[in-house]
Amino acid sequence: ASNFDCCLGYTDRILHPKFIVGFTRQLANEGCDINAIIFHTKKKLSVCANPKQTWVKYIVRLLSKKVKNM
């Protein structure tokens, strides 16, 4: 759920890391209402996820590790 590039809510699905090519952080104090992780998928979709959820943290950690190792 996004509006003018801002997430307004969170997905209720769990995504697999293999589906995700990258992410963007949305911060509530930078013009949007909520904090969010915006996952960019291989199907060119943007998915708004809750940064507090374990599965979201796990994927962010995985992707961050990948970037570090490049």
Epitope: R13, I14, H16, K18, F19, K42, K52, Q53, W55, Y58
Partner: antibody, heavy 120, light 107 residues
Framework: QVQLVQSGAEVKKPGASVKVSCKAS????????MHWVRQAPGQGLEWMGV????????TYAQKFQGRVTMTVDTSTSTVYMELSSLRSEDTAVYYC?????????????WGQGTLVTVSS | DIQMTQSPSSLSASVGDRVTITCRAS??????LNWYQQKPGKAPKLLIY???NLADGVPSRFSGSGSGRQYSLTISSLQPEDFATYYC?????????FGGGTKLEIK
């Protein structure tokens, strides 16, 4: 060693609710998801939903939305699955299964199953 | 939701045979696929995760392959204990749908 021990068989009347428990041991309970999967007699496996014991986050299959509730008691390392408004088609063996990020989100350990019979 | 179609639904084979079970997803699942074995009256057991990786304690006669929408499970030389029902499962995105199962019977 990892063990998931489920509660015993239940017989329920149509319209009633059932609550099945799954007690985990042998691992750090909050580090893994818990899934619920059911299997009607002679049928295949059907994924019902999952709960993350670390924050009680749940997501359910659309088919069970509004009828299923998964909860967790971290003090006893137990997960519960409650299914309401039971009908005869809900007669099945219900399994809890540990979800493991580390092995490609697979269900690497399963409970022994709980038979729920719905009959008038 | 992603649909998983397994074939064949049943299969008769003999000890020592090489058998292959296939699983087709309704869309690309990028290798996010697991295989389980289930014996009558027992809980399923994880065999293969991530399409190709053997789970702990699973004999090397089992192997998984595939990508995109098409996946397969191969048993290189059937043993008596392998006669069971096999299920594939999509874990790309919830709901985590299963294939309908393949029942492997003794010929």
């Amino acid at each position: 060693q990892v063990q998931l021990v489920q509660s015993g068989a239940e017989v329920k009347k149509p319209g009633a609710s059932v609550k099945v428990s799954c007690k985990a041991s042998g691992y750090t309970f909050t580090n893994y998801w818990m899934h619920w999967v059911r299997q009607a007699p002679g049928q295949g496996l059907e994924w019902m939903g999952v709960i993350d014991p670390s924050d009680s986050y749940t997501t359910y299959a659309q088919k069970f939305q509004g009828r299923v509730t998964m909860t967790v008691d971290t003090s006893t390392s137990t997960v519960y699955m409650e299914l309401s408004s039971l009908r005869s088609e809900d007669t099945a063996v219900y399994y809890c299964a540990r979800g493991n990020y580390g092995v490609d989100y697979a269900m690497d350990y399963w409970g022994q199953g709980t038979l729920v019979t719905v009959s008038s | 939701d992603i649909q998983m179609t397994q074939s064949p639904s049943s299969l008769s084979a003999s000890v020592g045979d090489r058998v292959t079970i296939t699983c087709r997803a309704s869309e690309n699942i990028y290798g996010a696929l697991n295989w389980y074995q289930q014996k009558p009256g027992k809980a399923p057991k994880l065999l293969i995760y991530g399409a190709t990786n053997l789970a702990d304690g699973v004999p090397s006669r089992f192997s998984g392959s595939g990508s995109g929408r098409q996946y397969s499970l191969t048993i290189s030389s059937l043993q008596p204990e392998d006669f069971a029902t096999y299920y594939c499962q999509n874990v790309l995105i919830t709901p985590y749908t299963f294939g309908g199962g393949t029942k492997l019977e003794i010929k």
